[in-house]
Interface confidence: medium
Amino acid sequence: MEDEKPKVNPKLYMCVCEGLSCGNEDHCEGQQCFSSLSINDGFHVYQKGCFQVYEQGKMTCKTPPSPGQAVECCQGDWCNRNITAQLPTKGKSFPGTQNFHLE
């Protein structure tokens, strides 16, 4: 539930938010938190945030990691704080890639 006391508050979680979609905020609230990593123009792009409606994250969170994108989802307040999504390496590195946090 949302806070400790009430029985009728939406079950939303506070999530760490990092990336362009966050604007000036460092947090967001939703039914699921996520941490993602994708390769965009040779850069590793890390993002964190939330899915406000459970259905939004249902497909995304169930998608297995691919060489180009990985998303990890969780439910719980600030649960994505210490999660860093990882791409499957299969013993290979991606030449010319750099780590890059979208701000």
């Epitope: 949302e2 806070d3 009430p6 029985k7 009728v8 508050n9 079950k11 039914q31």
Partner: antibody, heavy 115, light 106 residues
Amino acid sequence: EMQLVESGGGLVQPGGSLKVSCAASGFTLSDSSIHWVRQASGKGLEWIGRIRSKPYSYATAYAASVKGRFTISRDDSKNTAFLQMSGLKTEDTAVYYCTGGDDFWGQGTLVTVSS
Amino acid sequence: DIQMTQSPSTLSASVGDRITITCRASQSISTWLAWYQQKPGKAPKLLIYKASSLEGGVPSRFSGSGSGTDFTLTISSLQPDDFATYYCQQYNTYWTFGQGTKVEIK
């Protein structure tokens, strides 16, 4: 006895502003999210928005009908929450309730928007 | 936004009747649904939360059921004090209320 008491309602002209208060007694408001719900005469209940507690960064959310016009805030040291209304329209005329969820509801305060 | 559709809007019944009010959500809300009773000039009173959990002090003649998108409030034997307006409320994503069902004396 646990209760919430709203105050600050009254008559305001269209386009005007008003700040309604919600004071708690008998329990600590700071533990809970505070929601505001309104009810026009003879109509149903409409959720306006809410403010979460300190551990949740006092996050606010609003119904589309009031977003950008209404602001919810709280002062935990005074055990009070507030609803600041601006750009008021005649259709905002209603009884405004605050609630901490469960059976913690105020008695409501009437806001009338009319010229 | 999640929409809540309640039916009927008015229900005429007699003391002792068993009545059922239904509520439908525009998308799945699991069991994050509450039922309220409201009397004229008074604030709403919580009867049921989490679709079927009875709030403390509420008579056992009130019961709720359902999950996903379809929910019901049942009063097993209507009492004089039960003539009022009833609202369903989803709290899966913020709050939305149904339009209300007025239970009146037949």
